[in-house]
Every structure is written in structure tokens, then in C-alpha cells.
């Protein structure tokens, strides 16, 4: 007899963007609409909850901008939250300082990728430091991962 | 009697490097010679062609450097083309504005690289606002992807 | 009889942090504690050495910072070499040049990632152009690869 | 055809100010940043300061701090130098001169203000 | 600031014969492969006219008798064979830093 079909593993992989309503940190994201992906990892309160633990190639992309540059530090932190450890751990961060000209409209972004080893139930998040200079467009402003 | 050798599918796989003579949008690219890749995918008047319905990370570094800033407005996108669809979908964006001293020597960067669902016939392009900022060497403007 | 269990092959897999007794180039690189990442690859004096052909996406972040900006060019290289070719070849490169303001306190990252095609005994290095003015964090200061 | 048309000659009087003008046309003004440079007999020339044209925001050669002034008015494609305080040291001619971002050069230059300081 | 010195300070050359002007630079004006410094023409009554820039490269529309060379710190216009429309002012001009310096000219005479 013919052995029975392989069952395809679904993909573990997350791609979710900005959403504007985020009031506070950690950042919020869509994910439901637009270019979004969300499979085998949960989305929880800002946060991706890894369900099986391995190796995972995880991404951030912040776009910060504003009107007249007066040079506020930026700085853009992915972390991780697990209720095994007291702390929150940063695993990827980005700072800018003295990044524009004093008073001019002005835009840059800050990017981070990396492989990490994560478990079972570890909550991954995005800190930013100055929420009213993040533009949340799809395109521009995104959070994802992927099991290797 | 052993069974029959299982066939390695070809990775899908592209890494494209700055190509000098790009003269409008979108981007063109070096498909051939230097440290290019190219295997299961196509490449068709600066698109990378996707044949296989699937889950992709794409990636883009374009490097812009002038040598008197006039600090003009710099954009960067990676964007989707399906005949389907009538508009074009920009996947991922960086803008700069207010990013160097006046007059001065300037060089920047802009990198982008995202995890997306992409399906058989889509064209992957890259569009940047000011050509004539692009510098073109293979290790410092490219365009590429690989399906998970 | 039931066939033999699959043996699972290592991932092979690299994430070094920033190690802030670099005195030289190129970078040197935690390996052991931390975050870090080293599966099937090797470390060797700064180099991550390749012991599989083969496909790899390759990452690096390199966090450039100071307390009196004097805009001195910035670099960042990810690079090979194999004793098999005379020279070295750079496979990803950023620059920065005008990129604050004279004098004062600043902070900028620089971030690299693409796809290579990679032979066993490859060496992978990251280069910078001024080691005084790296912040070596493990959160902002990094080098990484895995096998497709 | 690309044209930097300057203002006219001045004669002015020590002590007072003098605002020379540069109107662009036959390009995108936006596109470059504008230049000035000071061509005395005692000195050749000397390059004052650069504008952007697009932010309009300035850098002067620290000689020239305090005694020449850049702006830009971007819908007349014209860039303006103040010249305050005015001295017999002041009298030259002043050239306006495009630079573009992706080149090497001042490509295209005005034909020249005259200013000349006398009581 | 980048100080840059021409010699000579004036020349007179025979029509159809070589014009050899040299610029030095108090630091060099290299960066990353490329040498900043350009050289213009200058009639009396006239704005500077660009000839070469980043060292060697003719700017459109000037003819090949002119040539741009060196790099670093010394650096060298020719012209040849000299032309009757030719006699000018010669000025070079870094720009590869803030403040932009020119030198002091040199003016070519036709004999």
C-alpha cells in the first residue's frame, strides 16, 4: 500500500505593520488587514507569542518622522517577555541621536533583523521612544518573523 | 528494492546587484556577472518574476550619496506588480528627508527586507525618487529574495 | 520493520554579539555567552568559517556612536576571503558620510543583510572604518548567518 | 538653456547693506544646491557659502559670518546674499553658482554682481 | 582649510605648443578613489568657466586639447596645442570639504 500523504507543516511566520492607535508601548500592529501574515505564532496585546520553540529570524522596521527637528534621541527596540525571567530581554535595539537639521521637516528610519533561539510561550514586542514621531503606514513601519 | 533518490528541488533564490546604466524606473539590475544569484525565479526589465505561490523574504539595500546636499526628499520601495491587480502595491518604503549638512559630502543607506505571501506572476521592483543619487556598486545597492 | 528514525541535521546558524575588546580589524565577536548563536559554523579570530557549501543568508549591525560629532566617513563591510583567491571580496558594504551635527553627542546604525552563495572554508568578517567610535552591545552590535 | 541671471551693479555707501540676487531658469532650481564666491583683485576668489535650495538652509565660510546672508525664494527660483556692514574691503564681484548633488562641480554660474563701497 | 597653490602665477606659450599648470594641495583632496579638485577658465568680463572635474574628467562641451591629472596632493592642467582662445586666467578648486578654496590663478598668455 501507498504510504499515507505527507502532512505540509504549516509555516510558523508573522508580518504585521503599523496601526496608528497605538497609545503606549509596547507598540500595537495590525493584523488582520492589508499585507499582513500571521501563522502558527498567536498576536497578543503588541505582542508575538512564539508556540514552538527553534530558531527564528526575527525583523523590525520603525519610520520616524516629524515636522521641525529639534533631535529627540530615537530609539527603536525589539525585546522579549517570557514569565520565566523577571526582566525583559532586548534582543535587537537601534538608537539615532543628531540625526536632522534643527527645525526642518525631516524622516529617517531605523531597521533590525536577526536570528534568535526562542521558546515555547516567549512574548516578542517593540519598544519605540518617541510614539508621536512614528509614521504607521503599512509600507514603512512593519514586525515579523519566521521559524527557520 | 531501495527507494528511488529524492529529487533536491532547486532553492528559489535571487540576489541582484546595482546596475549603472538604470536610466529611469524602475531599477535595473546586474543579473549576471559578480556575486549575482538567479535559481528558480526570473528577472524581466528590473522585476525579479515569481513563478511559485509562496511565502518570501525580500530584501533591498539602495546607497545614495551626493556631493553637495541639497537634502532632496529620498525615497526607497520595493513594490508588487500582478496583472490581476490594476495598481501597484508598495510592499515596503524608507523615506529621508533632512538627512546631511548643506553643501556638504553626504553618503546614506537605506535598507528594507520583509517576509510576504507572494503568488505565481507577481514582478518585484525597486523604485528609488532620485536616480541620479544612486551609487551602483555591487556590495552597496542590491535587490533580492529567497522563498522559506 | 518500521524505517530508521530521521536524523534531524543541525541548523547551521550564527548570531555574535559585539565584543568591545576589538583592537584591531577585523571586529571580534562574543561567541559564548549572551545571545549568541553558533551551530555548524565556526568562529576563528573575528571569521565565521563556513563548513558547508551552500546558500546563507548573512546579516550584520554595526552601532556607530560619539560624543563630538566631527563627521568622520563611516564604513561598514561584510567581507570574505578563502585561500583560494588573493583578495578579499566585500559582499555588503554601508557608508556614511554628513550624517550629524558638528559638535554635538550622536548615534547612528548601519545594517546589512543579503543572500550568498558560500563554499565550504569561506571566511566571514565585518570591517568598520573607525573602531573608536563603536558601541559593542549585544543588542546593537552584531554579525549572523544561517543556511538556507 | 540653463541661465543664472544676476541683479545689477551696486554702488553703495560704507556702513549699509546690499541684497544681490540670482534667479535660475532653464532647470529644477530645487535640484541644486546655489553657491557664492567672491572674485576681488586682492584675493582671487573665495567661496562664501552654500544654500539648499530645497530647505533652505545655509553654511557660510567662517570669514564670512555676519557679513553675507543666504536665502532662497523658491517659488522665483531666486536666491538672494545679503551683504551687511559694508567696508572698501567689500567691493567685488559676487558670483552665484549651481552645484549639482551628483556631481563634482560648480557647472553653471551667474555673470557676476558688481558692488563697489565708496563714500 | 585646504590651502591650494598654483604655479605659476603667470605663462607665456607659443601657439600650437604646451601649457603645463600646477596646482598643490596643503592636504590631499582624495576620497574613496575619487580626487576633488576641478579646474575652471576665467576671461576678463566673464563668469569661471568649469573645464575638468574630479581631477581628469573634461566637462561637456570643452575641447580635448585640455587635460586634467594627479592626485593626492599634486595635481596638473595641460593644454595642448595651445589656441589664440586660450588666454585666460586658470584657477583650480577642491571640493572635497567645507570651506571650498581656490588658487591663486595663473594667467596664460599667448605669444
Known amino acids: 500500500p501507498s504510504p499515507p500523504p505527507e502532512k505540509k507543516e504549516l509555516r510558523k511566520v508573522a508580518h504585521l505593520t503599523g496601526k496608528s492607535n497605538s497609545r503606549s508601548m509596547p507598540l500595537e500592529w495590525e493584523d488582520t488587514y492589508g499585507i499582513v501574515l500571521l501563522s502558527g505564532v498567536k498576536y497578543k496585546k503588541g505582542g508575538l507569542v512564539i508556540n514552538e520553540t527553534g530558531l527564528y529570524f526575527v525583523y523590525s522596521k520603525v519610520y520616524f518622522r516629524g515636522q521641525s527637528c529639534n533631535n529627540l534621541p530615537l530609539s527603536h527596540k525589539v525585546y522579549m517577555r517570557n514569565s520565566k525571567y523577571p526582566q525583559d530581554l532586548v534582543m535587537m535595539e537601534g538608537k539615532m541621536m543628531s540625526y536632522c537639521t534643527t527645525g526642518q521637516m525631516w524622516a529617517r528610519s531605523s531597521y533590525l533583523g536577526a536570528v534568535f533561539n526562542l521558546t515555547s510561550a516567549d512574548h516578542l514586542y517593540v519598544n519605540v521612544s518617541e510614539l508621536s514621531l512614528v509614521n504607521f503606514e503599512e509600507s514603512q513601519t512593519f514586525f515579523g518573523l519566521y521559524k527557520l | 528494492p531501495s527507494p528511488p533518490p529524492e529529487k533536491k528541488e532547486l532553492r528559489k533564490v535571487a540576489h541582484l546587484t546595482g546596475k549603472s546604466n538604470s536610466r529611469s524606473m524602475p531599477l535595473e539590475w546586474e543579473d549576471t556577472y559578480g556575486i549575482v544569484l538567479l535559481s528558480g525565479v526570473k528577472y524581466k526589465k528590473g522585476g525579479l518574476v515569481i513563478n511559485e505561490t509562496g511565502l518570501y523574504f525580500v530584501y533591498s539595500k539602495v546607497y545614495f550619496r551626493g556631493q553637495s546636499c541639497n537634502n532632496l526628499p529620498l525615497s526607497h520601495k520595493v513594490y508588487m506588480r500582478n496583472s490581476k491587480y490594476p495598481q501597484d502595491l508598495v510592499m515596503m518604503e524608507g523615506k529621508m528627508m533632512s538627512y546631511c549638512t548643506t553643501g556638504q559630502m553626504w553618503a546614506r543607506s537605506s535598507y528594507l527586507g520583509a517576509v510576504f505571501n507572494l503568488t505565481s506572476a507577481d514582478h518585484l521592483y525597486v523604485n528609488v525618487s532620485e536616480l541620479s543619487l544612486v551609487n551602483f556598486e555591487e556590495s552597496q545597492t542590491f535587490f533580492g529574495l529567497y522563498k522559506l | 520493520p518500521s524505517p530508521p528514525p530521521e536524523k534531524k541535521e543541525l541548523r547551521k546558524v550564527a548570531h555574535l554579539t559585539g565584543k568591545s575588546n576589538s583592537r584591531s580589524m577585523p571586529l571580534e565577536w562574543e561567541d559564548t555567552y549572551g545571545i549568541v548563536l553558533l551551530s555548524g559554523v565556526k568562529y576563528k579570530k573575528g571569521g565565521l568559517v563556513i563548513n558547508e557549501t551552500g546558500l546563507y543568508f548573512v546579516y550584520s549591525k554595526v552601532y556607530f556612536r560619539g560624543q563630538s560629532c566631527n563627521n568622520l566617513p563611516l564604513s561598514h563591510k561584510v567581507y570574505m576571503r578563502n585561500s583560494k583567491y588573493p583578495q578579499d571580496l566585500v559582499m555588503m558594504e554601508g557608508k556614511m558620510m554628513s550624517y550629524c551635527t558638528t559638535g554635538q553627542m550622536w548615534a547612528r546604525s548601519s545594517y546589512l543583510g543579503a543572500v550568498f552563495n558560500l563554499t565550504s572554508a569561506d571566511h566571514l568578517y565585518v570591517n568598520v572604518s573607525e573602531l573608536s567610535l563603536v558601541n559593542f552591545e549585544e543588542s546593537q552590535t552584531f554579525f549572523g548567518l544561517y543556511k538556507l | 538653456e540653463v541661465q543664472l541671471q544676476q541683479s545689477g551693479a551696486e554702488l553703495v555707501r560704507p556702513g549699509v547693506s546690499v541684497k544681490i540676487s540670482c534667479k535660475g531658469s532653464g532647470y529644477t532650481f530645487t535640484d541644486y544646491t546655489m553657491h557664492w564666491v567672491k572674485q576681488s583683485h586682492a584675493k582671487s576668489l573665495e567661496w562664501i557659502g552654500v544654500i539648499s535650495t530645497y530647505q533652505g538652509d545655509a553654511r557660510y565660510n567662517q570669514k564670512f559670518k555676519g557679513k553675507a546672508t543666504m536665502t532662497v525664494d523658491k517659488s522665483s527660483s531666486t536666491a538672494y546674499m545679503e551683504l551687511a556692514r559694508l567696508t572698501s574691503e567689500d567691493s567685488a564681484i559676487y558670483y552665484c553658482?549651481?552645484?549639482?548633488?551628483?556631481?563634482?562641480?560648480?557647472?553653471?554660474w551667474g555673470q557676476g554682481t558688481s558692488v563697489t563701497v565708496s563714500s | 582649510d585646504i590651502v591650494l597653490t598654483q604655479s605659476p602665477a603667470s605663462l607665456a606659450v607659443s601657439l600650437g605648443q604646451r601649457a603645463t599648470i600646477s596646482c598643490k594641495a596643503s592636504?590631499?583632496?582624495?576620497?574613496?578613489?575619487?580626487?576633488?579638485m576641478n579646474w575652471y577658465q576665467q576671461k576678463p568680463g566673464q563668469p569661471p568657466k568649469l573645464l575638468i572635474y574630479a581631477a581628469s574628467n573634461l566637462e561637456s562641451g570643452i575641447p580635448a586639447r585640455f587635460s586634467g591629472s594627479g592626485s593626492g596632493t599634486d595635481f596638473t592642467l595641460n593644454i595642448h596645442p595651445v589656441e589664440e582662445e586660450d588666454a585666460a586666467t586658470y584657477y583650480c578648486?577642491?571640493?572635497?570639504?567645507?570651506?571650498?578654496?581656490f588658487g591663486g590663478g595663473t594667467k596664460l598668455e599667448i605669444k
Open positions: 592636504q590631499s583632496v582624495d576620497y574613496d578613489g575619487d580626487s576633488y
Open positions: 578648486q577642491h571640493s572635497r570639504e567645507l570651506p571650498y578654496t
Open positions: 553658482a549651481r552645484f549639482p548633488d551628483w556631481d563634482y562641480a560648480m557647472d553653471y
